[in-house]
């Protein structure tokens, strides 16, 4: 079965530029009938996959992947690929994730604006999706394995 | 590619079984795959899949007595347990929709 | 509770002909996400269309599907004897749910 996927987006929320210890939001977006989305990082080795997608527009899901407390090893570049069965995406643009150092002073915004990576197209609609898979909750970080195109 | 079920069997009733389906030629990290079943002289009945996640999917009157899990990165399985007349049929496993194996029968009578 | 109803449980044409199937749904599918497969005795499934309307690989342009929401239909034109099967629709439904139809033979005279 094959169909022209179209490359997922990813942004992150509030910012790409986070205080140590706050949080992140990464969100990835592809089309209608995605089943699995995917965050990698740098590497394709460590990643984290969730079923628990919603449907954001009429054309287009999402997933959401938060990090509650931000480290310093959380910076760096992240993308996301998702599977529409029985095809995997390509990857998103990478996201670069930069983590400072909390000042304090008056003159430094906690966060810098909303960014995003690959089609901007932003979703009209966030409706909860009636299409997501109950109970489904972000998967462990593990190896991952070169995927086929089918 | 491929993919072929095994361990189907005679079973008295109340029993349990475990089936396995190999696969070969693709990874189970990438596709979803699909248990199927047929009584004899009968049409198709989904029972449910496991993603490449490894999140186990049923249909509602599986819920329970079917559990569905990978065993290797080349094998998964389905085990059935308080097995009926009924649960009588030939297992299919799937990638996704398009690559079936040739079945297993499995017979429940005592 | 996801039921997909093949009204036709047989439909016989000459060879050279055309038959329609009917498969009806419950509720509507996700994202079309209707599937034909093609039965014979003896033998696993064979997917011929998938997402409603695709034909899978290697499958003859005299099969196509089409519909939407709950109503689909598969047609076989220019019949031939090889196309004597029993043929099932499946449905995939919100929150990865699938279902069967109860299968329609095509008989080929």
């Known amino acids: 079965q094959e169909e022209d996927l179209p490359r997922p987006s990813i942004s992150a929320e509030p910012g790409t530029v986070i205080p140590l210890g706050s949080h992140v939001t990464f969100v990835c977006r592809g089309p209608v009938g995605v089943q699995t989305f995917r965050l990698e990082r740098e590497s394709r080795s460590t990643y984290n996959d969730t079923e628990d997608v919603s449907q954001a527009s009429p054309s287009e899901s999402e997933a959401r992947f938060r990090i509650d407390s931000v480290s310093e090893g959380n910076a760096g570049p992240y993308r996301c690929i998702y599977y529409k069965p029985p095809k995997w995406s390509e990857q998103s643009d990478y996201l670069e994730l930069l983590v400072k150092e909390t000042s304090g002073g008056p003159d430094s915004p906690d966060t810098e604006p909303g960014s995003s990576a690959g089609p901007t197209q932003r979703p009209s609609d966030n409706s909860h999706n009636e299409h997501a898979p109950a109970s489904q909750g972000l998967k462990a970080e593990h190896l991952y394995h070169h995927h086929h195109h089918h | 590619q491929s993919v072929k079920e095994s361990g189907g069997r005679l079973v008295t009733p109340g029993g349990s079984l475990t089936l396995t389906c190999t696969v070969s030629?693709?990874?189970?990290?990438?596709?979803?795959i699909q248990w199927v079943r047929q009584a004899p002289g009968k049409g198709l009945e989904w029972i449910g899949f496991?993603?490449?996640?490894?999140?186990g999917y049923y249909a509602s009157w599986a819920k329970g007595r079917f559990t569905i899990s990978k065993a290797s990165s080349t094998t998964v399985e389905l085990k059935m347990t308080s097995l009926t007349a009924s649960d009588t049929a030939t297992y299919f496993c799937?990638?996704?929709?398009?690559?079936w194996g040739p079945g297993t029968l499995v017979t429940i009578s005592s | 509770e996801l039921v997909l109803t093949q009204t036709a449980s047989s439909v016989s044409a000459a060879v050279g002909g055309t038959v329609t199937i009917s498969c009806q749904s419950s509720?509507?599918?996700?994202?079309?996400?209707l599937s034909w497969f093609q039965q014979k005795p003896g033998q696993p499934p064979k997917e011929l269309v998938y997402?409603?309307?695709t034909l899978q690989s290697g499958v003859p342009s005299r099969f196509s599907g089409s519909g939407s929401g709950t109503q689909f239909t598969l047609t076989i034109s220019d019949l031939e004897c090889d196309d004597a099967a029993t043929y099932y629709c499946?449905?995939?439904?919100?929150?990865?749910?699938?279902?069967f139809g109860g299968g329609t033979e095509v008989v080929v005279k």
């Open positions: 799937a990638r996704h929709w398009d690559l």
């Open positions: 030629g693709f990874s189970l990290s990438n596709y979803n």
């Open positions: 496991i993603s490449p996640a490894g999140n």
């Open positions: 509720q509507s599918v996700y994202s079309n996400y």
């Open positions: 997402w409603t309307s």
């Open positions: 499946l449905g995939g439904y919100s929150g990865w749910f699938y279902a």
